[in-house]
């Protein structure tokens, strides 16, 4: 018979034959042959593989480093990685939660809508037209543009969401 060019789901092609993939939680020890099945071994303690695979090494569980404010939210199994979270009152810097911050800052162009608490991180909002923020802050709201008119001045440079307007003297009309 012709050697296969593609294999079924949960199989892989090697040496012109289809071998079974190892199930999640197990790693490949040896490929199948004409006479033997694929040989797999369970991952060791603190290791995992989360897919049907042909990996020869399991992945190490993530370490939740207490020096970075991390603790274990969900212990890993042979089929799942450990999930880290931050100590109470701290917030993850990313979805992967690789480190913790007290709270995040809102970038220039954004103002603080709600200051962080022990439960929720800083909530930022974009500065609308007429307002700006030129700093990174965890407490400052967007500031209104300076009103040149109230100072008897005119706008020399328009404001943006990151910069205030620049006011200047009115042109005096010559008689």
């Amino acid at each position: 018979p012709e050697p296969p060019t593609a294999c079924r789901e949960k199989q892989y092609l090697i040496n012109s034959q289809c071998c079974s993939l190892c199930q999640p939680g197990q790693k490949l020890v040896s490929d199948c042959t004409e006479f033997t099945e694929t040989e797999c071994l369970p991952c060791g303690e603190s290791e995992f593989l989360d897919t049907w695979n042909r990996e020869t090494h399991c992945h190490q569980h993530k370490y939740c480093d207490p020096n970075l404010g991390l603790r274990v939210q969900q212990k890993g199994t042979s089929e799942t990685d450990t999930i880290c979270t931050c100590e109470e009152g701290w917030h993850c810097t990313s979805e992967a939660c690789e480190s913790c911050v007290l709270h995040r800052s809102c970038s220039p162009g954004f103002g603080v809508k709600q200051i962080a608490t022990g439960v929720s991180d800083t909530i930022c909002e974009p500065c609308p037209v007429g307002f700006f923020s030129n700093v990174s802050s965890a407490f400052e709201k967007c500031h209104p543009w300076t009103s040149c008119e109230t100072k008897d001045l005119v706008v020399q440079q328009a404001g943006t969401n990151k910069t205030d307007v620049v006011c200047g003297p009115q042109d005096r009309l010559r008689a």
Epitope: L68, E87, C100, V101
Partner: nanobody
Framework: EVQLLESGGGLVQPGGSLRLSCAAS???????EMWWVRQAPGKGLERVS?????????YYADSVKGRFSISRDDSKNTLYLQMNSLRAEDTAVYYC?????????WGQGTLVTVSS
């Protein structure tokens, strides 16, 4: 790497005053927003006060408004918290925090106990 060292805590009677200091070393201090945060025994972290990098803007939690005052001296790389009219509920460990507020830049704190 930035090191933050809080000092000035102690035992004080209700109605008394204390001035906390936070000395920063190993990193630029000027231009960075700074916070005072406290943790009462058995409670979570409470954000008490903040000051902008320029020193022009400040924030105070409602619980300390009118009693606490935050300031900074960039020439001394030091942040201050003047605490007046102290109450029993101000008893806590006080920490300072510097942008970007990472856990590994956290100081040891200074304990303030308000008791008669």
């Amino acid at each position: 790497e930035v090191q933050l060292l809080e000092s000035g805590g102690g035992l004080v009677q209700p109605g008394g005053s204390l001035r906390l200091s936070c000395a920063a070393s190993g990193s630029t201090f000027a231009g960075y927003e700074m916070w005072w945060v406290r943790q009462a025994p058995g409670k979570g972290l409470e954000r008490v006060s903040a000051i902008s990098g320029s020193g022009g803007s400040t924030y105070y939690a409602d619980s300390v408004k009118g009693r606490f005052s935050i300031s900074r001296d960039d020439s001394k790389n030091t942040l201050y918290l003047q605490m007046n009219s102290l109450r029993a509920e101000d008893t806590a460990v006080y920490y300072c925090a510097k942008e970007p507020y990472s856990f590994d830049h956290w100081g040891q704190g200074t304990l303030v106990t308000v008791s008669s």
